[in-house]
């Protein structure tokens, strides 16, 4: 239904707190360099304006679109060109081109310092003084570093943050209460960020149809008792919500997500028996809970998939009649039978089925041609299963840090031209798949591993797009989203690469490394490892292990020495010589 004033409508639906939070996220995601205070001022102005429209929908400018209102605010910022360069050119455009222009200027890797968490006492003091401002800072800092973060979900994480601080700041030992809890939220939020970025990439590169296919597969796995019409309705609504968030329409997105959660809770009988616990929660927790609800029990009497999609005499007729619907029912039927497959795998199978029908239905005897299609799925299923087994075995043998190093070597060999910081970030993230997925029950490993790896590789592709340096990476990133992970897995040593010359300063370390937190120490060592591989791309695992063990021993010795500086300056050059010899 059309509303006289869109901004008044959204303010009324969302309430002041969520409205302000979402506007702050929107501004922070568009203009990533502005300070919190600059954005907070804009948010207050927008909120005051929204209130005047609530009071009188006919008031001046209340009928303007949200894009127009928000865009005008952003374009009125002083020194826009000095701070943002060509983004200022967006302000010469009219809507909807102006908003599209803002979206194109979102930076997936902004040059902002890492978000440092203050120490516990200081956090609790500022939280107690002004919880609203404290949470505003959190939203601003996360949103500007993650310009595609799923806005309603960021409100949920802010709420989690709030609850943790409320609880822990009342404790005697604030630090030991806060650290593990906030680390947990941070880890979940980072995973949420890469997953959502993948969804936006799918939407941006391949359109709504591709995202809807993803949603059908995912929802069918989770709700195997829901019929195809119900799954289609949910997938359509979910596609709309994600399209809005990916497009910067955060108020609409949050509002529609709340509507979808409401619909699901009102229609549990036709969706799933597992929703009640989620539906008893307040809004943000409810929507979050529904997004990761456990799979419903699969119906016991599902017929073999072949009946309708291979053996039925009217396969080609049904396909001709309505291709998307027929392929959609195939994806639905296959997915509801396979909660143990990744969505990426299910989409690859659906793509294979579609290609088979395209080819076979044009032949004189289609049934003879497509009759073996399900058997042809086997290699497509075996490949990720082997990937999971091999990698989880390696993870169990090496632990997370060792597993990250193994991946770092592998990926540096595949794409040695990629910058070392990007390779280290990617390997660390890819390596976390072990901790995240390999400890799960067997039937949950594959979907966890592959869908997580796909999201991380999507980030690799986004970073590589900014400065394309590797033909290998370009090749894998140019294909469809679901083919990326198999493409990266299949890459071998890049034979075209000319090894980097050995620079002693790359492997020279100082005593300041000793006081770094464990994570930073690991990154330093992994940076050195990537550089070693760039110097000797064909070094054996044994050679690299020798060098890294020697390096670890050197750090341990010098960091325990009474005169650390002397130890580093005398032993460092010896280490460099030994490294060169070991890799010769």
């Amino acid at each position: 239904e059309a509303h006289k004033s869109e901004i008044a409508h959204r303010y009324n639906d969302l309430g002041e707190q969520h409205f302000k939070g979402l506007v702050l996220i929107a501004f922070s995601q568009y203009l990533q360099k502005c300070s919190y205070d600059e954005h907070a001022k804009l948010v207050q102005e927008v909120t005051d304006f929204a209130k005047t429209c609530v009071a009188d929908e006919s008031a001046a400018n209340c009928d303007k679109s949200l894009h127009t209102l928000f865009g005008d605010k952003l374009c009125a910022i002083p020194n826009l060109r000095e701070n943002y360069g060509e983004l200022a050119d967006c302000c010469t455009k009219q809507e909807p081109e102006r908003n599209e222009c803002f979206l194109q200027h979102k930076d997936d890797n902004p040059s902002l310092p890492p978000f440092e968490r203050p120490e516990a006492e200081a956090m609790c003091t500022s939280f107690k003084e002004n919880p609203t401002t404290f949470m505003g800072h959190y939203l601003h800092e996360v949103a500007r570093r993650h310009p595609y973060f799923y806005a309603p979900e960021l409100l949920y994480y802010a709420e989690q943050y709030n609850e943790i601080l409320t609880q822990c700041c009342a404790e005697a030992d604030k630090e030991s209460c806060l650290t593990p809890k906030l680390d947990g939220v941070k880890e979940k939020a980072l995973v949420s960020s890469v997953r959502q970025r993948m969804k936006c990439s799918s939407m941006q590169k391949f359109g709504e149809r591709a995202f809807k296919a993803w949603a059908v597969a995912r929802l069918s796995q989770t709700f195997p008792n829901a019929d195809f019409a119900e799954i289609t309705k949910l997938a359509t609504d979910l596609t709309k919500v994600n399209k809005e968030c990916c497009h910067g329409d955060l108020l609409e997105c949050a509002d529609d997500r709340a509507e979808l959660a409401k619909y699901m809770c009102e229609n549990q009988a036709t969706i799933s028996s597992k929703l009640q616990t989620c539906c008893d929660k307040p809004l943000l927790k409810k929507a979050h809970c529904l997004s990761e609800v456990e799979h419903d029990t699969m119906p016991a009497d599902l017929p073999a998939i072949a009946a309708d999609f291979v053996e039925d005499q009217e396969v080609c007729k049904n396909y001709a009649e309505a291709k998307d619907v027929f392929l959609g029912t195939f994806l639905y039927e296959y997915s509801r039978r396979h909660p143990d497959y990744s969505v990426s795998l299910l989409l690859r199978l659906a793509k294979k089925y579609e290609a088979t029908l395209e080819k076979c239905c044009a032949e004189a005897n289609p049934p003879a041609c497509y009759g073996t299609v399900l058997a042809e799925f086997q290699p497509l299923v075996e490949e990720p299963k082997n990937l999971v087994k091999t990698n989880c075995d390696l993870y169990e043998k090496l632990g997370e840090y060792g597993f990250q190093n193994a991946i770092l070597v592998r990926y540096t060999q595949k794409a040695p031209q990629v910058s070392t910081p990007t390779l280290v970030e990617a390997a660390r993230n890819l390596g976390r798949v072990g901790t995240k997925c390999c400890t799960l029950p067997e039937d949950q490993r594959l979907p966890c591993v592959e869908d997580y790896l796909s999201a991380i590789l999507n980030r690799v592709c986004l970073l590589h797009e900014k400065t394309p340096v590797s033909e290998h990476v370009t090749k894998c990133c140019s294909g469809s989203l679901v083919e990326r992970r198999p493409c990266f897995s299949a890459l071998t040593v890049d034979e075209t690469y000319v090894p980097k010359e050995f620079k002693a300063e790359t492997f020279t370390f100082h005593s300041d490394i000793c006081t770094l937190p464990e994570k930073e120490k690991q990154i330093k060592k992994q940076t050195a490892l990537a550089e070693l591989v760039k110097h000797k791309p064909k070094a054996t695992a044994e050679q690299l292990k020798t060098v890294m063990d020697d390096f670890a021993q050197f750090l341990d010795t010098c960091c325990k020495a009474a005169d650390k500086d002397t130890c580093f300056s005398t032993e460092g050059p010896n280490l460099v010589t030994r490294c060169k010899d070991a890799l010769a």
Partner: nanobody, 115 residues
């Protein structure tokens, strides 16, 4: 919506000829193999002939081989069946179908071979 409309049937004497047509709409005609199937009075469906989307490959049931010719005009989205040397046992309702399968999906056209 997929539509298949058969025509060209009628009464013919043994040894005579008929040409059946099937006008197709609602789908990308050249992307699909097409077939003719028939149903004699009181009998089940019987596959007669199939042709690939491009028209390059054709298949025939042994009972009609050498007498019937299947063809298509992709520009006109029409399927044909040229039937020569007709016999009384060819009497049946003839249906055109998508995808080379024996599936009854339209009204058909009646062919009666009788003296």
């Amino acid at each position: 919506k997929v539509q298949l409309l058969e025509s060209g049937g009628g009464l013919v004497q043994p040894g005579g000829s008929l040409r059946l047509s099937c006008a197709a709409s609602g789908f990308t005609f050249p992307s699909f193999g097409m077939s003719w199937v028939r149903q004699a009075p009181g009998k089940g469906l019987e596959w007669v002939s199939s042709i690939s989307g491009s028209g390059s490959d054709t298949l025939y049931a042994d009972s009609v081989k050498g007498r019937f010719t299947i063809s298509r005009d992709n520009a006109k989205t029409t399927l044909y069946l040229q039937m020569n040397s007709l016999r009384p046992e060819d009497t049946a309702v003839y249906y055109c179908t998508i995808g080379g399968s024996v599936s009854k999906s339209s009204r058909g056209t009646l062919v009666t071979v009788s003296s």
